[in-house]
């Protein structure tokens, strides 16, 4: 099974002397998830032509994937560390239902999909410890998530493939933006 960052003593300098919320730990964790996403994207692109498809907009209309916007304060222009940290945590919480959807979408990378899901949960915990302004963080309603999951799983094969591709692409972009922003916190 994939090793989570910090489980392997070679992976992190002085593993026991670092708080879980340290910049390096969080950075490593995000990079670990990004590596997992790359592996999943590889399988998705190999088994379908979704990665070259120009029909993404059709499927995107059905999805409400978290996305960084100027108002979230996570870009260089208008950077706001408190607002941004809340957005990162909220966005990750919103991605959880989509990561759950991905669990049955992979054959050879089934373990990798599980690792991405589990390490995202751990990342959320790390970031919640780091966040001071926890009141502003809204958790998605379980019932809303359940109905969204049912709706996604009921799509035809082409839409399911496209949805998988879009989730992975959006999650990658969200994490890359988070990585850049967290560097200045």
């Amino acid at each position: 099974a994939p090793v989570l960052p910090g489980e392997d003593s070679k992976d992190v300098a002085a593993p026991h002397s670092q708080p879980l919320t340290s910049s390096e730990r969080i950075d490593k964790h995000i990079r670990y998830i990004l590596d997992g996403i790359s592996a999943l994207r590889k399988e998705t692109c190999n088994r379908s032509n979704m990665c070259e498809s120009s029909k993404e907009a059709l499927a995107e209309n059905n999805l409400n994937l978290p996305k960084m916007a100027e108002k979230d304060g996570c870009f260089q222009s208008g950077f706001n560390e408190d607002t941004c940290l809340v957005k990162i945590i909220t966005g990750l919480l919103e991605f959880e239902v989509y990561l759950e959807y991905l669990q049955n979408r992979f054959e050879s990378s089934e373990e990798q999909a599980r690792a991405v899901q589990m390490s995202t949960k751990v990342l959320i915990q790390f970031l919640q410890k780091k966040a001071k302004n926890l009141d502003a963080i809204t958790t998605p309603e379980p019932t809303t998530n359940a109905s969204l999951l049912t709706k996604l799983q009921a799509q035809n094969q082409w839409l399911q493939d496209m949805t998988t591709h879009l989730i992975l692409r959006s999650f990658k972009e969200f994490l890359q933006s988070s990585l850049r922003a967290l560097r200045q916190m």
């Epitope: 670092q18 910049s23 950075d27 990079r31």
Partner: antibody
Framework: EVQLLESGGGLVQPGGSLRLSCAAS????????MSWVRQAPGKGPEWVSR????????YYGDSVKGRFTISRDNSKNTLYLQMNSLRAEDTAVYYC?????WGSGDYWGQGTLVTVSS | QTVVTQEPSFSVSPGGTVTLTCGLS?????????PGWYQQTPGQAPRALIY???DRHSGVPDRFSGSISGNKAALTITGAQAEDEADYYC?????????FGGGTQLTVL
Amino acid sequence: EVQLLESGGGLVQPGGSLRLSCAASGFTFSSYAMSWVRQAPGKGPEWVSRISAGGGSTYYGDSVKGRFTISRDNSKNTLYLQMNSLRAEDTAVYYCANRAGWGSGDYWGQGTLVTVSS
Amino acid sequence: QTVVTQEPSFSVSPGGTVTLTCGLSSGSVTASNYPGWYQQTPGQAPRALIYSTNDRHSGVPDRFSGSISGNKAALTITGAQAEDEADYYCALDIGDITEFGGGTQLTVL
């Protein structure tokens, strides 16, 4: 053009205090974490402290923890280092630097000399 | 306390290639340590050469390149010139702090 200009250095007695300032220009100061790095005569650089872009988080090297305080005023584009209980080993050139990120590297000022001696 | 290690000294012939390394006393250097490289000549402030492992600072000649090789960060100078004779320091983010190496004194013979 990025410019960082340190000031406030000078000669101070052991146990004394000093406040360093760093005036920043040429970049979006409030979007960058900022650091103080020092270099004792004939030695290599030593990281002293860092403050997050919004000022909400501060970090310190073991040698200055509890004695030095980093702060910033984003409305004035200025970084500060309050140094208390100064020791002879704090004698160094103090540089301020922005944290690499947003696609650009870190820039350093020319430094201000702090001498702790009786 | 994790120590950042560098070769104390190195020499290279003009036009030659040299690789300086930056390691950790415990563990491997990764991209999450954001390796940075600095050049310092006598009487001058350190000058940033490389940040975030392999990004070249603006105005730095392309003979300077950064990488992670094995478990260390590396600075390679390809086609060394006389003006490259200087002290080179690496810096790593470790946990929430930054640690500098002891430096490598590079001589261009």
